[in-house]
């Protein structure tokens, strides 16, 4: 799992590859802060609850965020 509590940022390694939006349990976007100078995106998968760190600079990940946002706006009344 590419996570660590011993460094200021949560993510050690990040992926440029998107996942299927339907396989996501949760998608956390952690803004840059005094503790970590970069935006971090943590995807929790439905299967096994595995967490993955995604690269916010990747176009494919931006496309994923767009798809998730669109899906959420469809669901909300």
């Amino acid at each position: 799992v590419p996570l660590s509590r011993t460094v200021r940022c949560t993510c050690i390694s990040i992926s440029n590859q998107p996942v299927n939006p339907r396989s996501l349990e949760k998608l956390e976007i952690i803004p840059a802060s005094q503790f970590c100078p970069r935006v971090e995106i943590i995807a929790t998968m439905k299967k096994k609850g595995e967490k993955r760190c995604l690269n916010p600079e990747s176009k494919a990940i931006k496309n994923l965020l767009k798809a998730v946002s669109k899906e959420r706006s469809k669901r909300s009344p």
Epitope: S15, N16, Q17, P18, V19, N20, P21, S23, M45, E50, R52, N55, E57, S58, K59, A60, I61, N63, L64, K66, A67
Partner: antibody
């Protein structure tokens, strides 16, 4: 040199199953997602979906849900596309294409595999 | 899904001619369009990405422009080896879509 080498042409009967391979070389297989594209005879390109090569998770375009299965063998840097219950309309050239995910376009393609479905 | 309407579907031109192909997206694709060349019996080859960025090794007679929903691919001076079918691809979405293709022939 980055290369995607696909398996050879297949002739199958209706109802059969075909499995096409796409073996990559020249880069780290798990660094890029792999997409599949279909081209029916004399027709245009149709995107079928992709597989995340880090976790082996496939995503299918709406028109390719059900009979299509994308899988991987990371030990041999090979992606597979399996198509079951073949019909005559599945006759096409199937391409694998590497997606340069950081920018999200297809930068390298396999040479294509022709699948002919005929009784 | 985003639809890509490519025109014309076929085009006949002479060597040295300026050739233009257009793709219109059903919504704004923020310049995320690529252009591919496909010769008979061969795989598509990437020529241009992000509207106008030429791939290394691609001749400068190929160019692209556009924004919003409207995009153009141009060959400034047609060469015999440019005879092929050309496709646009939008990638501003998790669901990719190709244009229908333009078959380019020599007069």
């Amino acid at each position: 040199e980055v290369q995607l080498v696909q398996s050879g042409a297949e002739v199958k009967k209706p109802g059969a199953t075909v499995k096409i391979s796409c073996k990559v070389s020249g880069y780290t297989f798990t660094d890029y997602s792999m997409h599949w594209v279909r081209q029916a005879p004399g027709k245009g390109l149709k995107w079928m979906g992709w597989i995340n090569t880090e976790i082996g998770e496939p995503t299918y375009a709406d028109d390719f849900k059900g009979r299509f299965t994308f899988t991987l063998d990371t030990s041999t840097s090979t992606a597979y596309m399996e198509l079951s219950s073949l019909r005559s309309e599945d006759t096409a050239v199937y391409y694998c294409a590497r997606n340069y995910d950081y920018d999200a376009y297809f930068d390298v393609w396999g040479q294509g595999t022709t699948v002919t479905v005929s009784s | 899904d985003i639809q890509m309407t490519q025109s014309p579907s076929s085009l006949s031109a002479s060597v040295g001619d300026r050739v233009t192909i257009t793709c219109k997206a059903s919504q704004d694709i923020n310049k995320y369009i690529a252009w591919y060349q496909q010769k008979p019996g061969k795989a598509p080859k990437l020529l241009i990405h992000y509207t106008s960025t030429l791939q290394p090794g691609i001749p400068s007679r190929f160019s692209g422009s556009g924004s919003g929903r409207d995009y153009t691919f141009t060959i400034s001076s047609l060469q015999p080896e440019d005879i092929a079918t050309y496709y646009c691809l939008q990638y501003d979405n998790l669901l990719f879509t190709f244009g229908q293709g333009t078959k380019l022939e020599i007069k």
